[in-house]
Amino acid sequence: IWELKKDVYVVELDWYPDAPGEMVVLTCDTPEEDGITWTLDQSSEVLGSGKTLTIQVKEFGDAGQYTCHKGGEVLSHSLLLLHKKEDGIWSTDILKDQKEPKNKTFLRCEAKNYSGRFTCWWLTTISTDLTFSVKSSRGSSDPQGVTCGAATLSAERVRGDNKEYEYSVECQEDSACPAAEESLPIEVMVDAVHKLKYENYTSSFFIRDIIKPDPPKNLQLKPLKNSRQVEVSWEYPDTWSTPHSYFSLTFCVQVQGKSKREKKDRVFTDKTSATVICRKNASISVRAQDRYYSSSWSEWASVPCS
Amino acid sequence: RAVPGGSSPAWTQCQQLSQKLCTLAWSAHPLVGHMDLREEGDEETTNDVPHIQCGDGCDPQGLRDNSQFCLQRIHQGLIFYEKLLGSDIFTGEPSLLPDSPVGQLHASLLGLSQLLQPEGHHWETQQIPSLSPSQPWQRLLLRFKILRSLQAFVAVAARVFAHGAATLSP
């Protein structure tokens, strides 16, 4: 058993049929010694008396808020949560496996630049009685500070018969050094509590590996005289690291109709303009990627050919 | 060329060669994203490699103030990786695929280090650690980790030379 926060404790249980469970001793936070009784949750049934209560925790019915009283007055609470371990593996029932970029990916994180700011998100089908707490650091043995905000519900989607909820959190490295080569990864830890179930999820990454620039901005077209060709120009996204002579992007420019199966024109460039062939009912799209490190491409920025 | 006396390197040549290094480092090990090497005890095997750190003057302001600190750090790293790629980690079993770009990568590391430090001038170089894995599978894993680390190193070096070519070239 360990303390998650004040008056909230996590009991780690090997979860299998007829498991013996864990013996837990609760102590009432009071100077009183006599006349103390214990109850669980809203029940008035007295579970025991005395300053300590010994219980055998085997299942969720044994978890909950234990309260010690004296003469009708509440002295203190202890909330017990369960953390299940099945076949040596901690349960992952609360969050959905996003399976990208690999199986058992529960947390996904992205950064728009090298400033040390990043966003992580996760998915669940649970809508109520759900809380998250996020901590992060650079490195684990001698951790350096990363400050995370509160996790918030950022999107709801319908997937078949189920509703899916997306939560996200923003974090910022306290002393980021955008130009340096990272040697220690960022660690992100998410505590998830659903009713009386506790789970924790972790992710470890370098900022360079989660970079995904915003799409290029201010796409403009200029038809070339006596030609089917069009000069398309754009700018670096505002959120990208500066100076651009140091933090350079490379671009992919594509002309395509509405269907992916349609024919296309495609060219890669390090410049902020390119010449392509525009077709009726097609769109010109541009996306960006770090020029020197193959992290994710941005989403496309598009303008119609007409 | 960046000689210890402090004259400027051939920024544009260094830029071209460092960009080539980036391309080669990724073609030598393109599937890095599919293998989470940090799960394999990453810190004790590759924390000996020289990293370009915050105080090394490789940021745009540091380069403007005095690029020599940064160039020396990059030179150390290039020599270090060049030795690693020539060591039995890469030459031993399992043999590299005949079309592996590691040979080109090795030559390009040497080429860039020579651009930075001509014959007869010597910056101090970092000792190469004795990473001699006994098992072929350990060697394979170590190769992946070294190439992964090299990708990050040459990315920073390429940014330095691109910025230098754009803003510090005479």
Partner: antibody
């Protein structure tokens, strides 16, 4: 499968014109760009231009501007390349080539030998 | 127009050996570079597109690398059917242009 079949060899006199055909099969004709590339005997490849069979748009290499016309007939899935004012150095194998991507060539015809000789 | 230069013009290699073919552009073309193989009396065949992307059906012994102005086609272990002429082609800008070709012949 995607296939391009070209017309047979031609022998022309200097100053004449030649029209080479290229019949496409195995795909929807308007779904691919069509290019013409030529190769003089013992020489390398030279791009001449492209046509979009969907709308007839064309782009010619500057060298061939004014001397070449590329057309298509969607009813027969056939592309044509006409070269006018032939000279002896137009003697070459002329290839049609197609792709869904505009700037490189995925599928090639077998080539048509055009000999310009007096 | 962009001039593409291939070297060497002829490469003599023994079967089973590795062949490295070079292609240089007269200006930076990012990764807009494609490789073709042509055997005598036949049309060219696309091997690699956008510098390093492999084509299904093309043996894995063919690989491409490079960006900017310098590109390489590597044939890791030459088979008898690989003796041919190889062309690079840039697609950075029109007119599309080819290199002069490298003939890979039996040593």
């Amino acid at each position: 499968q995607v296939q391009l079949v070209q017309s047979g060899a031609e022998v022309e006199k200097p100053g004449a014109s030649v029209k080479v055909s290229c019949k496409a099969s195995g795909y929807t004709f308007t779904d691919y760009y069509l290019h013409w590339v030529r190769q003089a005997p013992g020489q390398g490849l030279e791009w001449m231009g492209w046509i979009d069979p969907e709308n007839g748009d064309t782009e010619y290499a500057p060298k061939f501007q004014g001397g070449v016309t590329m057309t298509t007939d969607t009813s027969t899935s056939t592309a044509y390349m006409e070269l006018r004012s032939l000279r002896s150095d137009d003697t070459a194998v002329y290839y049609c080539a197609a792709n869904k991507e505009l700037r490189y060539f995925d599928v090639w015809g077998q080539g048509t030998m055009v000999t310009v000789s007096s | 127009e962009i001039v593409m230069t291939q070297s060497p013009a002829t490469l003599s290699v023994s079967p089973g050996e590795r062949a490295t073919l070079s292609c240089r552009a007269s200006q930076s073309i990012s990764i807009n570079l494609h490789w073709y193989q042509q055997k005598p009396g036949q049309a060219p065949r696309l091997l690699i597109y956008f510098a390093s992307q492999s084509i299904s059906g093309i043996p894995a012994r063919f690989s491409g690398s490079g960006s900017g102005t310098e590109f390489t086609l590597t044939i890791s272990s030459l088979q008898s059917e690989d003796f041919a002429v190889y062309y690079c082609q840039q697609s950075n800008s029109f007119p599309l242009t080819f290199g002069g070709g490298t003939k890979v012949e039996i040593k």
